[in-house]
């Protein structure tokens, strides 16, 4: 019989008492085969973290800073359940740390040196740890003691709770630096008042502070937020302009064998019976013998943290950077305006080899990082382990939802001004063998399908989106008799046609021979009835253009396109017979890397782009013999995006809407995780 006990860790007598009450009340409402609670008492949160890691306890609820400690080795804990605040309809699990300034003050984030600062309190998250952590490497040396470095960075501050004797500049704007509401500039509202009164130039607070203190929109319009990319935004655009997104209070568990499903089952049942306004005799979010015992008193309920989300992703790049800077106190030798090497994310073995060759030739400008799937690469870019990669539009959508931005677009047509003219896109098509003359768009049911990969534009999002509109369900593996759609569940019929060996079968990378445009076409040639690819795929792999044994004798005339009106046309008539127009592949990165990725890639394409005539002996960035490694092989150049610099603007309203409709069919664990952070 599996043990269905969750050992909850308590950090005080009062918490232990509430835990026992929690245990007893759960017993009275949950059947004997359901989850139960046991209580483990420890002296501190850090002791609880160690106990969970050592399998002496299973769960504890932590503030963000402690979630970071819990994630560090050797603890390796992960977030499993989040408390939410506000309403069930609009649950808030995060708050945003922001830098508020007056509208007419005219300086940016990188010009804070010498300004006057207002903080909620020394050592507090939004008011101190996050802003000072992010500014850490700009502080004058020596950076220890930290208070002294901060005092020398700003021209005056109010940092309640600081030592006014040792660091008088930190109390310059609020004499005495009182650590309670007796100090008018203490806490969130106090720090904002410090700015409002004109004592300070910038206030480090929560996104809600300004709304709580200024009910009138006209008054709020006198203030702006400083963004990390050295721009400003209105105060209501805090989701796109903040220092960090911080989880409020989170239940953590072991990463391996952590009982996360059991913990969720327990807490979900607990909130049903003892949540807000549910029961008089025991209330989960109430602490008669103290404050915030086990859970925050202000919490309204729990949400399950998506399983793909580790602590780094949950806390977010900015928060982790800030806390790591404060804890480790390490900075690059001397901050320079020069760009650090761009860490390119390579998918599996073959891309890694090409990336290594690029790295050797780039002379220190490109480094390589490997991952097994596109989603793993996106996650690595999010958390700073990697910086950039080029993505199909379907993954540009996921990357965008995860906070990344497009920076350059692949262009596929030769033109005089290639780098300045991003193209409208390419065509997604359905290809069949000419010999299968009875096959049309209207009778694909039961046929064998070949896809570039799940989540990609031409191979999945466009054809499956159109199919979904017709069949109104997501069981595509039942619609086709079998197929190869790399990235599908291994036991799905949509992995049956794939050719990868062993663990590589149906993997969404080049270890699966039927992956990508060329792979999907090969799948059609060898096994399938229809392939969903781009309009250039057939000509690029026929007429001897692909020297591989399976392709060298193929003839373009032996293939036709399926049109949406039920007719068929020759391959060259793609402009009048396609499924939809697809946005070109694009390079994505984090916002903080945007300028450097743009600069370095433009240099790199001038050295190794289409201007290189002999690729047999020289490195060519856009060549890999139809394998589309790192970039599509038909890329002519990487083009500036001009104002199409967000994923929505880049992909266009129509495509974003189409992918949004397919979301209900999405199996993307990363998309689920990212929409948890930003619904």
């Amino acid at each position: 019989v599996p043990d269905k006990t969750v050992r909850w860790c308590a950090v005080s007598e009062h918490e232990a008492t509430k835990c026992q009450s929690f245990r007893d009340h759960m017993k009275s409402v949950i059947p004997s085969d359901g989850p139960s609670v046991a209580c483990v008492k420890k002296a501190s949160y850090l002791d609880c973290i160690r106990a969970i890691a050592a399998n002496e306890a299973d769960a504890v609820t932590l503030d963000a800073g402690l979630v970071y400690d819990a994630y560090l080795a050797p603890n390796n804990l992960k977030p499993v359940v989040a408390e939410f605040y506000g309403s069930k309809e609009d649950p808030q699990t995060f708050y945003y740390a922001v830098a508020v300034v007056k509208k007419d003050s005219g300086f940016q984030m990188n010009q804070l040196r010498g300004k006057k600062s207002c903080h909620t309190g020394l050592g507090r998250s939004a008011g101190w740890n996050i802003p000072i952590g992010l500014l850490y490497c700009d502080l004058p040396e020596p950076r220890k003691p930290l208070e002294k470095a901060v005092a020398n960075f700003f021209s005056g501050s109010c940092a309640p709770c600081a030592d006014g004797t040792d660091f008088p500049q930190l109390c310059q704007l609020c004499p005495g630096c009182g650590c309670s509401t007796l100090n008018q500039y203490f806490g969130y509202s106090g720090a904002f008042k410090c700015l409002k009164d004109g004592a300070g130039d910038v206030a480090f607070v929560k996104h809600s502070t300004i709304f709580e203190n200024l009910a009138n929109k006209a008054d709020r319009d006198q203030y702006e937020l400083l963004c990390l990319d050295n721009t400003r935004k209105p105060v209501d655009e805090y989701k796109d302009c903040h220092l960090a997104q911080v989880p409020s209070h989170t239940v953590v568990a072991r990463s391996m064998g952590g009982k996360e499903d059991l913990i969720w089952e327990l807490l979900n049942q607990a909130q049903e019976h003892f949540g807000k306004d549910k029961s008089k005799e025991f209330q989960l979010f109430s602490s008669p013998h103290g404050k915030d015992l086990l859970f925050k008193d202000s919490a309204h309920g729990f949400l399950k943290v998506p399983p793909r989300m580790d602590a780094k992703m949950y806390l977010g790049y900015e928060y982790v950077t800030a806390i790591r800077n404060l804890r480790e106190g390490t900075c690059p030798e001397a901050p320079t305006d020069e760009c650090k090497p761009v860490k390119w994310c390579a998918l599996s073995h073959h891309e890694r080899l090409k990336c290594d060759e690029w790295s050797v030739n780039s002379v220190g400008k490109i480094e390589c990082v490997s991952a097994e799937t596109t989603e793993d690469c996106i996650a690595k870019i999010m958390n700073g382990e990697a910086d950039a990669m080029s993505l199909d539009g379907g993954f540009v959508y996921i990357a965008g939802k995860c906070g990344l931005v497009p920076v350059l677009a692949e262009n596929y047509n030769k033109s005089d001004n290639c780098e300045d003219t991003p193209e409208a896109g390419y065509f997604a098509i359905a290809v069949v063998k000419k010999s299968a003359s009875d096959l049309t768009w209207d009778n694909l049911k039961g046929k064998k399908s070949c896809h570039t990969a799940v989540g990609r534009t031409a191979g999945w999002n466009i054809p499956m989106g159109l199919l979904y509109n017709k069949i109104n369900h997501c069981r595509f593996d039942e619609f086709f008799s079998e197929g190869c759609a790399p990235g599908s569940k291994k036991d799905s019929s949509l992995c049956k046609l794939c050719m990868g060996s062993g663990l590589n079968l149906c993997e969404p990378n080049n270890k699966e021979g039927y992956y990508g445009y060329t792979g999907a076409f090969r799948c059609l040639v060898e096994k399938g009835d229809v392939a969903f690819v781009k309009h250039q795929t057939v000509p690029q792999n026929t007429g001897g253009k692909n020297p591989d044994p399976w392709a060298k004798n193929l003839n373009e005339k032996d293939y036709e396109l399926l049109c949406l009106d039920g007719t068929r046309k020759p391959v060259e008539e793609y402009a009048n017979c396609h499924l939809a127009r697809a946005p070109n592949h694009a390079v994505v990165t984090r916002k903080d890397k945007e300028a450097c990725v743009h600069k370095i890639l433009r240099q790199q394409q001038h050295l190794f782009g289409s201007n290189v005539t002999d690729c047999s002996g020289n490195f060519c960035l856009f060549r890999s013999e139809t394998k589309d490694l790192l970039f599509r092989d038909d890329t002519v150049c990487l083009a500036k995006l001009h104002d199409r610099n967000t994923y929505e603007k880049y992909l266009g309203e129509e495509y974003v809407k189409a992918v949004g409709n397919l979301r209900k069919c999405s199996t993307s664990s990363l998309l689920e995780a990212c929409t948890f952070r930003r619904p």
């Epitope: 073959h350 050797v360 030739n361 690729c615 047999s616 002996g617 020289n618 490195f619 394998k627």
Partner: nanobody, 117 residues
Framework: QVQLVESGGGLVQPGGSLRLSCAAS????????MAWYRQAPGKQRELVAG???????KYADSVKGRFTISRDNAKNTVYLQMNNLKPEDTAIYYC???????????WGQGTQVTVSS
Amino acid sequence: QVQLVESGGGLVQPGGSLRLSCAASGSIASINTMAWYRQAPGKQRELVAGITSGGSTKYADSVKGRFTISRDNAKNTVYLQMNNLKPEDTAIYYCTDYSKRYYQDYWGQGTQVTVSS
């Protein structure tokens, strides 16, 4: 396709040195990038050092300051001088010319380097 043959491996004590050679069956003068990789048991193959035709080099962080890559186009050979060897340098070392534009698995036999006391 140029064939590459690696040699020079062996058993050496920590702190010792070895010089690996990679002899090509044809001219390497027109080949831009040559590189040494290594693969330890149960690990992924990783880039150790690379050199371009112009003599620009790149090294893995773990070997910087200890290993030196060089090429002699006249002798159609690429070398890897390995000093101050450590137990974690134990692996099979392979040479590549990246000449297959689609980066398939065309590796030679490699040469075994074992660093142990």
